[in-house]
């Protein structure tokens, strides 16, 4: 905290300019009018203030706006944003996407800080949903943003926003998140033709149910092994050898290299060895010929 002292004669700041870098902290406190600072915040960013000097400028704004800064000031905070605490940011009402972009730019290239997380949370809550433009902006700055949300939060994403999602945005999503996103993606891309549809839906297939995988197997999609390995095990298990062969197309040969890993391993255990042999890949572990397969889960459902 800087002590209150009178501004020396002739040092009262008439505008925010580079001459202020020569002021000591107490002089900044005494000689810079907070209202002037608020109206000329955009100039602060072009002046190489020390971090200590920035602390003084922040303190002046805090005194002027104890209930939280107005958006006109927030938009021009620049570096000063890095001085804000999550508690400061919770007082803000940020509604403009331009303001959000300006502040994310300051943190660009760094991990998502608690300040940024709080800012995004405030912004999204203020909008009521994660619309396409917001999602576009957030994933541009933080590709992993979508996968940092809980399934409950993801449920507020409208299907139209899914168009903004790139494959790399889903890299760190877990099955629970993909379970929420997949139906939205299916709805968003429903009017696309077969091959185009598959290109768009591919990244979301970790949330696809068995019946959708069966449908895809009829469309010559040639799913790659990396995508297949991310499918839900429970969705893959009911697929027949013929369906998997059609689903993977020329990539079916890759099953051999993955036969010890889920979901391939579990799927092999559910197939007749006879059927697996038709692939000619030497896959082992299927149900031996002559064995009767009882689907106990079906039996329980009937009784």
């Amino acid at each position: 905290e800087v002590e209150k002292t009178a501004c020396p004669s002739g040092k009262k700041a008439r505008e925010i300019d580079e001459s202020l870098i020569f002021y000591k902290k107490w002089e900044l406190e005494a000689c810079v009018d907070a209202a002037l600072l608020a109206t000329q915040m955009d100039r602060v960013n072009a002046i190489p203030f020390t971090y200590e000097q920035l602390d003084v400028l922040k303190h002046k704004l805090d005194e002027l706006y104890p209930q939280g800064y107005p958006e006109s000031v927030i938009q021009h905070l620049g570096y000063l944003f890095l001085k804000m605490s999550p508690e400061d940011i919770r007082k803000w009402n940020v509604t403009s996407l331009e303001t959000l972009k300006a502040l994310l730019e300051v943190n660009k290239g760094h991990e998502m800080s608690p300040q940024v997380a709080t800012l995004i949370d405030r912004f999204v809550k203020g909008r009521g949903q994660l619309d396409k433009d917001t999602l576009d902006t957030l994933t541009a700055f933080y590709p992993g943003y979508l996968c940092s949300l809980s399934p409950e939060e993801l449920s507020s994403v409208p299907p139209s926003s899914i168009w903004a999602v790139r494959p790399q945005d889903l890299d760190t999503c877990d099955p629970r998140q993909l379970d929420v996103l997949y139906p939205k993606a299916r709805l968003a891309f429903q009017n696309m033709n077969g091959s185009e549809y598959f290109v768009k839906i591919q990244s979301f297939l970790g949330g696809a149910p068995t019946e959708d995988l069966k449908a895809l197997s009829q469309q010559n999609v040639s799913m790659d092994l990396a995508t297949f390995m991310k499918l839900r095990t429970d969705a893959v298990l009911p697929l027949t050898v013929a369906e998997v062969q059609k689903l993977l197309g020329p990539h079916v040969e890759g099953l051999k290299a993955e036969e010890r890993h889920r979901p391939v391993r579990d799927w092999i255990l559910r197939q007749r060895q006879d059927d697996l042999d038709t692939l000619g890949l030497g896959l082992q572990g299927g149900i031996p010929n002559g064995y009767l397969v009882l689907d106990l889960s079906m039996q329980e459902a009937l009784s």
């Epitope: 960013n45 072009a46 190489p48 020390t50 620049g78 570096y79």
Partner: nanobody
Framework: LQLVESGGGLVQPGGALRLSCAAS????????IGWFRQAPGKEREGVSY????????NYADSVKGRFTISRDNAKNTVYLQMNSLKPEDTGVYSC????????????WGQGTSVTVSS
């Protein structure tokens, strides 16, 4: 992405030194540069400033007429020529860059030590 200062050292009162502030990993063209110094136990203070174009310079009262700031954008470097040095000029000198595209970047150097003593 960083700023690296050099040129500091031990010099006698009345002597001269030329400090350099070089940018590595980014171009200084769009950045305003400030030179600061910090003496042991004292607050860091601004010494000199140069605008991104080089058209505007400014100095602390204590160094006016003795220090000159300049920039060579082709060499991605800003210089501080210090003449008629005094013992009170002793301290760690560091440079800072502010501005850049969209005015959203800032960089600080680690500093170079200047000692003025007989």
């Amino acid at each position: 992405l960083q700023l690296v200062e050099s040129g500091g050292g031990l010099v006698q009162p009345g002597g001269a030194l030329r400090l350099s502030c070089a940018a590595s990993g980014f171009t200084l063209d769009y950045y305003a540069i400030g030179w600061f110094r910090q003496a042991p136990g004292k607050e860091r203070e601004g010494v000199s400033y140069i605008s991104s174009s080089g058209g505007s310079t400014n100095y602390a009262d204590s160094v006016k007429g003795r220090f000159t700031i300049s920039r060579d954008n082709a060499k991605n470097t800003v210089y501080l020529q210090m003449n008629s040095l005094k013992p009170e000029d002793t301290g760690v000198y560091s440079c800072a860059a502010a501005g850049g595209y969209g005015n959203s970047s800032r960089y600080w150097g680690q500093g170079t030590s200047v000692t003025v003593s007989s």
